[in-house]
Amino acid sequence: KFSKQSWGLENEALIVRCPRQGKPSYTVDWYYSQTNKSIPTQERNRVFASGQLLKFLPAEVADSGIYTCIVRSPTFNRTGYANVTIYKKQSDCNVPDYLMYSTVSGSEKNSKIYCPTIDLYNWTAPLEWFKNCQALQGSRYRAHKSFLVIDNVMTEDAGDYTCKFIHNENGANYSVTATRSFTVKDEQGFSLFPVIGAPAQNEIKEVEIGKNANLTCSACFGKGTQFLAAVLWQLNGTKITDFGEPRIQQEEGQNQSFSNGLACLDMVLRIADVKEEDLLLQYDCLALNLHGLRRHTVRLSRKN
């Protein structure tokens, strides 16, 4: 069974996404798995379905259970399951392990803590951040978009960080909190202008029509963990996600490697079932950090 765990606190908003993918135009039906009873789509209900999302506004402990989502896609309907657990609010400060999202690590050069699941909600900045239940105050802490930046990180900054924000639904406000652990790595390092190791500038890559092809964008940015370093691909100057060709996808998540002690990032561009029209596109490998941006261009040619 294709299922996903989700959790939340009573009297807070919880929004869950169907674990099966679908285009925005696809209808998604939600059901209580135990009773097979359909979940309403009318927003006046406390629990209602909204396309790929299931909304608990607010959640109650009794909402815990398995929910079925069926994506009404062409050819076959795709079924997913959301395993939802709603917990009672803790009276003390301790956040139990079962409420914790994945741990993140940081260093003096890189101290971003993302607020988990926030992309599912309709929220407005700024986020409130707490460490071990204490509101974070002082110029070292900066709430930026959906993450917290800590300047001059020290080992004492390790701990449990909670983000708190307000979800707005049709004029009504609901509180949401999410907690994750932050660990600090002691690291001496430096950053420099990005150096792209691959591909070479104006490289011609030979591909076979009808086969799959991979292009790797690889760049190094300095020594140690880097703050705001990224590599990505563009097609004809457009982000891959905006280009709209589903056969051409970036590999999710950037692979981090250390070459001769340098911090390097790879991003693989996967082209499924190469077509003639792919040969007409310009493929740009972009590497950027605080120092600036470097671009190497690749073109495809048909293998003889």
């Epitope: 285009k23 135009s25 696809y26 062409p74 050819t75 076959f76 079924t79 086969k211 799959n212 056969r247």
Partner: antibody
């Protein structure tokens, strides 16, 4: 080269069982739905089973309960277990590549050469 | 189940001349994403079928531009602008909106 190679066909008596295999190569197998389509001699094409990227399975009523499709992504393989076979199941069985990544549809763009199943006493 | 009906059953053609095959579905194949889930396949003698057209009008990779697909909803047409001797075989339409069902096929042969 993108290809699908079927095996496991043969002669079997009515009520018997057979397991067909399909070995895929040249593409990211785990990202695609896979189907089996059959064709009786001199007849048209009939879809007999499908399996999606997460292993959910789909069948027409004509084979439901008798045929089971499965996949082994680590081996780039898809299988069709056929039980309680009937004379009407006699056909060439094709392994076919289908939908990419749950919802990107490019047609059934790769077909194997087929393997022949004969059910008779 | 969606039923697919093709016509004609048999189509004698002259090389260099155009040819047209019709396919009708028992319900609309136009989905909410704006696509018609209708494909065309050609099975040449002694070979496996291969894809010609997907989603009503998109030519598959490597398919010559003399093949074109058109139509929407329940009525679809495959056109060959100038038939070549290599185009002989059985042409099938297939719907992919609700599971998969094929038309009965149209046999194209040289006059």
């Amino acid at each position: 080269e993108v290809q699908l190679v079927e095996s496991g066909g043969g002669w079997v008596q009515p009520g018997g069982s057979l397991r067909l295999s399909c070995a895929a190569s040249g593409f990211t197998f785990s990202s695609y739905d896979m189907y089996w389509v059959r064709q009786a001699t001199g007849k048209g094409l009939e879809w007999v089973s499908g399996i999606d990227t997460v292993g959910d399975t789909y069948y027409p009523d004509s084979v439901k309960g008798r045929f089971t499709i499965s996949r082994e992504n680590a081996k780039n393989s898809v299988y069709l277990q056929m039980n309680t076979l009937r004379a009407g199941d006699t056909a060439v069985y094709y392994c076919v590549r289908g939908i990419y990544g749950d919802f990107y549809y490019y047609g059934l763009d790769v077909w194997g050469h087929g393997t022949t199943v004969t059910v008779s006493s | 189940d969606i039923v697919m009906t093709q016509s004609p059953l048999s189509l004698p053609v002259t090389p260099g001349e155009p040819a047209s095959i019709s396919c009708r579905s028992s319900q609309s194949l136009l989905y909410s994403d704006g696509n018609n889930y209708l494909d065309w396949y050609l099975q040449k003698p002694g070979q496996s079928p291969h894809l010609l057209i997907y989603l009503g009008s998109n030519r598959a990779s490597g398919v010559p531009d003399r093949f074109s697909g058109s139509g929407s909803g329940t009525d679809f047409t495959l056109k060959i602008s100038r038939v070549e001797a290599d185009d002989v075989g059985v042409y099938y339409c297939m719907q992919a909106l609700q599971t998969l069902t094929f038309g009965g096929g149209t046999k194209v042969e040289i006059k």
